[in-house]
């Protein structure tokens, strides 16, 4: 059962796993959620009745029954991990904590103009977990405006104390705001020979890489495959670091793979979600339960629904035994990974999908693209919405994209003459416009947020957000698309599609079935040549064939230019403007979404 509220002046008794320090109960809850075993926690706030050495302690707890006895205690705040909840969660913490000094290893000290600049420095430094900044009111003259970058083994402070005129905060790497290089390569036949900070068992290099990404100290990794000559090291995932942040020595060794933490590009790839099945593979660990199940998929469901289950092994049924049901072994360990991995015993193993909600929903697999043809099929573009106006009569107005459970991203020019959000309706999960009847459910629009620098589509800033009155429940036919990460600014997208119900030629009508077209991106320089009378800015992106023939058109406005990269779809552009439709040497012009990520986050995360 999901319990989100915090219990004031309440302490959970027993079940302690470990104690960390956090600046707030809210952040303690996040730390508990991301810990492999924590289900409950007790946080101690600052209070005259409490020993100051216990202030800001966050005790992570576990319980077989998923609950613990409650005891009244002043200044204690307790609660449950979000593991039990179905809503999406994030480690992103933008809060700034006033008059708190978060202790750690101070490895870098420099002058900064503001706490924000200090936080940016931390976010752009590969080792930094959190920072403390002495403001210009700090009593000691030589320490004023000093920005201390800090790290610890756990990523959380080793202690937190009260200190006047300082502020502290965390790196925003987990908010996808780092400008650090994103290095996605996995190097075969390579061992990085730097110091190990931890080791876990993993079924493949991709899982090893994901574990490295969410491990606070891991910057790169080496994985020994199941063919590695030394038997005791097979399936071993070594989590590594170095002073420079880069591997110092690379050794060529067959059957080993190495790669990097994806912490600076984490919003465009799944990090926590290990969704594959591993055939002829047994995961060993502490046994939680043994249940009969029809298939390995059913076993994974059972594991996902059991809050303490971290991974499983399914043994298929022998011939006609047990009504064709096999045995599903639900398992756990101290770190969330198998204690050993064995091959050749016929088991099928995998991980809980409970942690998938810690990744952006937009990274989860969707239906494969249907190649050829121009009509889409249901569920092919689950982020695409149709925006209707009801005034003077109901009609399709523009396209849009689901980017969050209460947010649609679209074009600002769609709202010319729209006096009020009350006349707007957002329909999701729609393939054919003819499906929309009077009783078809829709989302009302609470607020239209148009970029304040928008004047007209051709001059840029053609971007708008719609805040919905109710939240979208994600399903196979309605789910969000990922925003491009600032760390991926330099990605060259080669698999881009424009979709919409718009005209198929300049003088036409709105289409019934959602149309799709694969369109290549065009450089801004090339695009500028085609539009001499306009200024094509870096906040615009162009797409189209030189010979024309495929393009967005009237009615597609506001809809997505969706590009697939590393198996994840990204909202690269918003259909904005162009000269005619599909004309030769006249590419379509789209709002370049990556340039507005900060604006989108600012508007959607505002309290």
């Amino acid at each position: 059962e999901c319990v989100t509220q915090l219990l004031k002046d309440t302490c959970f008794e027993g079940g302690d796993i470990t104690t960390v320090f956090t600046p707030s109960a809210k952040y303690c809850q996040v730390v508990c959620t991301y810990h492999p075993r924590c289900l409950l926690f007790t946080f101690t706030a600052e209070s005259p009745s409490e020993d100051p050495t216990r202030w800001f302690t966050c005790v992570l707890k576990d319980s077989v029954t998923e609950t613990l006895p409650r005891v009244n205690r002043t200044a204690a705040i307790s609660g449950y991990s979000f593991k039990q909840c179905s809503h999406q969660i994030s480690a992103c913490n933008k809060d700034i904590y006033v008059d708190l000094d978060m202790k750690g290893i101070n490895y870098n000290s420099s002058v900064a103009k503001s706490a924000q600049e200090c936080q940016e420095r931390c976010t752009d430094d590969v080792h930094c977990h959190f920072f403390t900044y002495a403001t210009r009111q700090f009593p000691s003259l030589e320490h004023r405006n000093i920005c201390l970058l800090k790290h610890t083994q756990t990523g959380t402070p080793t202690r937190i104390t009260k200190l006047d005129k300082v502020v502290s905060g965390f790196s925003l790497k987990s908010c996808a705001l780092s400008n650090l290089a994103c290095i996605r390569d996995i190097f075969p036949n390579t061992v990085f020979a730097d110091s190990n900070i931890d080791s876990v068992m993993a079924p493949d290099a991709f899982v090893c890489g994901r574990i490295c990404t969410h491990h606070p100290g891991c910057l790169f990794f080496t994985f020994f495959s199941q063919e590695w000559p030394k038997e005791s090291q097979r399936n071993l995932c070594l989590l590594k670091t170095s002073e420079s942040g880069l591997p110092s020595t690379r050794i060529k060794k067959s059957k080993a793979l190495s790669g990097f933490s994806l912490q600076s590009c984490r919003h465009s790839i799944p990090v926590f979600c290990h969704s594959s099945f591993y055939h002829d593979t047994d995961f060993l660990g502490e046994e939680l339960d043994i249940v009969a199940a029809k298939s390995h998929e059913a076993c994974q469901k059972l594991c996902t629904n059991a809050v303490r289950c971290q991974f499983f092994t399914y043994t298929p049924a022998q011939a006609s035994c047990n009504e064709g049901k096999g045995k599903c072994y639900l398992k756990l360990s101290s770190n969330g990974s198998p204690t050993k991995i064995l091959h050749g015993r016929g088991g099928i193993s995998g991980y809980t999908l409970r942690l998938c909600k810690m990744d952006n929903e937009c990274t989860t697999k969707i239906k494969p693209r249907i190649v050829g043809g121009t009509a889409s099929v249901r569920g092919e573009w689950p982020w695409q919405v149709t925006l209707h106006t009801t005034s003077p009569t109901q009609r399709h107005l523009c396209g849009g994209s689901i980017i969050g459970n209460q947010w649609i991203l679209t074009a600002a020019h769609c709202f010319y003459g729209v006096e009020s959000p009350k006349i707007l309706r957002v329909y999701s999960g729609i393939l054919n416009q003819s499906e929309i009847k009077e009783d078809t459910s829709f989302f009302g629009v609470q607020e239209i947020i148009i970029h304040d620098q928008y004047k007209m589509a051709e001059s840029g800033y053609d971007i708008a957000l719609l805040k919905l009155e109710t939240t979208v429940n994600y399903t196979d036919s309605q789910r969000p698309i990922c925003l491009p990460s600032k760390g991926d600014r330099n990605v060259i997208y080669t698999d881009c599609w424009v979709t919409g119900w718009g005209y198929r030629k300049l003088r036409d009508k709105i289409q019934n079935t959602l149309q799709k077209a694969k369109i290549p991106l065009v450089t801004n320089e090339e695009c500028q040549k085609r539009y001499r009378g306009h200024k094509i800015t870096h906040k615009m992106i162009c797409a189209g064939y030189r010979e024309g023939g495929k393009d967005a058109c009237k009615g597609d406005s506001g809809g997505p230019l969706s590009c697939k990269h590393n198996e994840v779809w990204h909202l690269v552009g918003i259909t904005s403007w162009g000269e005619g439709c599909a004309q030769r040497e006249r590419p379509g012009v789209y709002t370049n979404v990556v340039e507005y990520v900060d604006w989108i986050l600012e508007k959607t995360q505002a309290v």
Partner: nanobody, 124 residues
Framework: QVQLVESGGGLVQPGGSLRLSCAAS????????VGWFRQAPGKEREGVAA????????YYADSVKGRFTISQDNSKNTVYLQMNSLRAEDTAVYYC?????????????????WGQGTLVTVSS
């Protein structure tokens, strides 16, 4: 002692091409970031392109994407910047720089070693 030496600059007409080279001694490009930066008179130094030599991951400023290509030859310990479709606004002194830590690839403040620079002038 680390030395980075740029070459290949010169005068070129708009629309033309140039290839800059950066040769290193006392510093190996392998396992490090190498960046090309430029500085026009009266302007701040800006990142143009960078490469992480181990895997060849490349990073470009928006203003040069699609026109400039950064590449490496590890055997010669040299990094190149191929510049096509040059414009007047590309006129600047181009610097090669080496980093010894994991960096924001186009942030000049985070690079440790610098060459003397080579002048590129785009003019008709």
């Amino acid at each position: 002692q680390v030395q980075l030496v740029e070459s290949g600059g010169g005068l070129v007409q708009p629309g033309g091409s140039l290839r800059l080279s950066c040769a290193a001694s006392g510093y190996t490009f392998n396992n490090n970031f190498v960046g090309w930066f430029r500085q026009a008179p009266g302007k701040e130094r800006e990142g143009v392109a960078a490469i992480y030599s181990l895997g060849g991951s490349t990073y470009y400023a928006d203003s040069v994407k699609g026109r400039f290509t950064i590449s490496q030859d590890n055997s010669k310990n040299t990094v190149y910047l191929q510049m096509n479709s040059l414009r007047a606004e590309d006129t600047a002194v181009y610097y090669c720089a080496g980093a010894i830590t994991w960096v924001p690839p186009l942030s000049h403040r985070r690079y440790t070693y610098w060459g003397q620079g080579t002048l590129v002038t785009v003019s008709s």
